[in-house]
Amino acid sequence: HTAAQDNCTCPTNKMTVCSPDGPGGRCQCRALGSGMAVDCSTLTSKCLLLKARMSAPKNARTLVRPSEHALVDNDGLYDPDCDPEGRFKARQCNQTSVCWCVNSVGVRRTDKGDLSLRCDELVRTHHILIDLRHRPTAGAFNHSDLDAELRRLFRERYRLHPKFVAAVHYEQPTIQIELRQNTSQKAAGDVDIGDAAYYFERDIKGESLFQGRGGLDLRVRGEPLQVERTLIYYLDEIPPKFSMKRLT
């Protein structure tokens, strides 16, 4: 796996341990927590990043209305089970044998149950809505400049193909970034929208996962854009299954 050869580090994931023990003395990096080898030329999967995080020491209406099936990650951090490819396993359980089903971004999509709970497949999150509110500025940002800059950022920093940035909506001070990626659209080597959204979320919080690349510095025509709150909604290819009790 490619990593910075000279000092053997992983530019795309600081939560790794790297050593020149790959084939031919090449730098190889393994994710903390899981010990899985990671490809440092692309983003690391959210599942492996969450696992690494848990292993680390504690320290006129143009805006989109999320559908009734949109999920928000209210459960927060947990130590996930990842498959050999680094994806979330469909069923996650905690140490007290409480289990639940998750989608491809690791967000719970069913009520919690016991060890008998079945999660037949990992349901893909095909639409992510990132809702940002920026700090007050002298004037509104130009919408097309903002759109172009966010697309550039997702392409360069998160390596997400521009076709997966479906839209950028703007009603000062709210910015919404829509990411869409169906199973059929995602080719081998394409960054997953869930991974890109997670890196972006961590960047926005000032917790960059990149190494040697500085924090997120978002600017539109040279004007810094500072985000003061973020909400992320996840829409799955199959709607989630929660009991009515949760919905009331």
Epitope: T2, A4, Q5, P11, S41, R152, L153, R155, E156, R157, R159, F210, Q211, G212, R213, G214, G215, L216, D217, L218, R219, G222, P224
Partner: antibody, heavy 121, light 107 residues
Framework: QVQLVQSGAEVKKPGASVKVSCKAS????????MQWVRQAPGQGLEWMGW????????KYAEDFKGRVTISADTSTSTAYLQLSSLKSEDTAVYYC??????????????WGQGTLVTVSS | DIQMTQSPSSLSASVGDRVTITCKAS??????VAWYQQKPGKAPKLLIY???YRYTGVPSRFSGSGSGTDFTLTISSLQPEDFAVYYC?????????FGQGTKLEIK
Amino acid sequence: QVQLVQSGAEVKKPGASVKVSCKASGYTFTTAGMQWVRQAPGQGLEWMGWINTHSGVPKYAEDFKGRVTISADTSTSTAYLQLSSLKSEDTAVYYCARSGHGSSYWYFDVWGQGTLVTVSS
Amino acid sequence: DIQMTQSPSSLSASVGDRVTITCKASQDVSTAVAWYQQKPGKAPKLLIYSASYRYTGVPSRFSGSGSGTDFTLTISSLQPEDFAVYYCQHHYITPLTFGQGTKLEIK
């Protein structure tokens, strides 16, 4: 308009130190990083390091560590490059250049006019 | 460190010619590559950033492309003022590095 104005040419003896200044105007100093690049006579461009003017944290190229100090005075919107233990190979034009604070903006959109530092006994 | 290898190191062309300069990174740098033009005795000027984004005020005859490790700067129709030295630079990770330069001369 956005401008970076550097201090004048310097002639130094081997072993001495030099301090080059770069005064920024036309924008809010702390919203952009300041990079330093040098160019030896007839040679290419060599990155020396940069400073995040917002946090005040500098980062240096490995070849210059221990010899270079990059600093910034936000009250005067001025960045400084100090190079010590000068050798004849340090004879070059030294440029300051503006960039963003994150890697997606580590390209240099505005440059100073350059400061020629000559090291000669 | 990431090495940026530019080719050719020098190039002779005529006004009106289409010219392509290439830059190869020693490892994947996404689209984090910039191109500069430098004339004798002057500071470099930014032409392209993020591989393909033309900087404000740069004529449309200049274009950039590429991602990963291979990048190109194209001048579609050379003008007399375009004869200069051109440098690529990655802006992916520190340390930042430049290509060795391509000198574009009049044939």
